[in-house]
């Protein structure tokens, strides 16, 4: 396993609809054909997998069914979007990139993006 640098923004604020987007960029040392991108959430020293995708360079990302993530790729950048976020989902979201093919295998883990989610205030009832 060889190391690879991965960069991502330090902080992102989710929209009022619970959508957060950020760019995950990796420094590809070789001729990557297939890349796996995994988003991990770290909260209270626990790490859980949020979503994972695989893609061939130049093609769209393939996420597993029922994924809360979507994304696009451009060169060595992956634009990730996480949907359905609520205030309780606030935390550090780490981008993990693996160059799956061809060998040798490279692994890179970003420092994480702190995503802040603020639940929208419910609309007050109006009297007409």
């Amino acid at each position: 396993c060889k190391a690879m640098h991965v960069a991502q923004p330090a902080v992102v604020l989710a929209s009022s609809r619970g959508i957060a987007s950020f760019v995950c960029e990796y420094a590809s040392p070789g001729k990557a054909t297939e890349v796996r991108v995994t988003v991990l959430r770290q909260a209270d020293s626990q790490v859980t997998e949020v979503c994972a995708a695989t893609y061939m360079m130049g093609n769209e990302l393939t996420f597993l069914d029922d994924s809360i993530c979507t994304g696009t790729s451009s060169g060595n950048q992956v634009n990730l979007t996480i949907q359905g976020l609520r205030a309780m989902d606030t935390g550090l979201y780490i981008c993990k990139v693996e160059l799956m093919y061809p060998p040798p295998y490279y692994l890179g883990i970003g420092n994480g993006t702190q995503i802040y989610v603020i639940d929208p205030e419910p609309c007050p009832d109006s009297d007409f």
Epitope: E34, A52, T54, Y55, M56, T62, L64, D65, Y101, P102
Partner: antibody
Framework: QVQLQQPGAELVRPGSSVKLSCKAS????????MHWVKQRPIQGLEWIGN????????HYNQNFKDKATLTVDKSSSTAYLQLSSLTSEDSAVYYC???????????WGQGTTLTVSS | DIQMTQTTSSLSASLGDRVTVSCRAS??????LNWYQQKPDGTVKLLIY???KLHSGVPSRFSGSGSGTDYFLAISNLEQEDIATYFC?????????FGGGTKLEIK
Amino acid sequence: QVQLQQPGAELVRPGSSVKLSCKASGYTFTSYWMHWVKQRPIQGLEWIGNIDPSDSETHYNQNFKDKATLTVDKSSSTAYLQLSSLTSEDSAVYYCARRYTSSSFDYWGQGTTLTVSS
Amino acid sequence: DIQMTQTTSSLSASLGDRVTVSCRASQDIRNYLNWYQQKPDGTVKLLIYFTSKLHSGVPSRFSGSGSGTDYFLAISNLEQEDIATYFCQQGNTLPYTFGGGTKLEIK
């Protein structure tokens, strides 16, 4: 449409070598890795190795590293599998297949039936 | 090497049935599981890639699921043209390995 054309059959003598061909059409040959798979009735499907037609980088299954050699001819969009020191164990159907995402093979040749017999 | 096991070597079902073919890996393959159909004449086609993604042109009656080491191919409303042998293949680690196949027959 994508097509991988392979000869239907080859009959060769034990101890000799053979070069199986796989002619690709319908896509940019150098943009996709080509893989080779061996099939025997009892042993099932075995991955032999792969080659990147753009620069001829290869990777082999250790079980085939002394048996198989993969090459390509970019000018004719053809991939080749050469098998050496043939024995009856090499009698099988050999498929070429184009690599797709998640290391799947989205298009396969019809297969070449290799018979090693004296 | 990762071993891929299809415990059922043959399966008999009636037209219109829903059938499930299973495949187990000797270690976690992280959803890099693909399914193929091989017809009696030797023709091989990709059905499902990355566990559940339907390859273009494949009828929607085919579906895939699973995670970790256990994966499944389901065929609903079985048709005569589905008579074939189905193979799973892991694409997580070289060398890529295949299951032994499950031959589907009509009752």
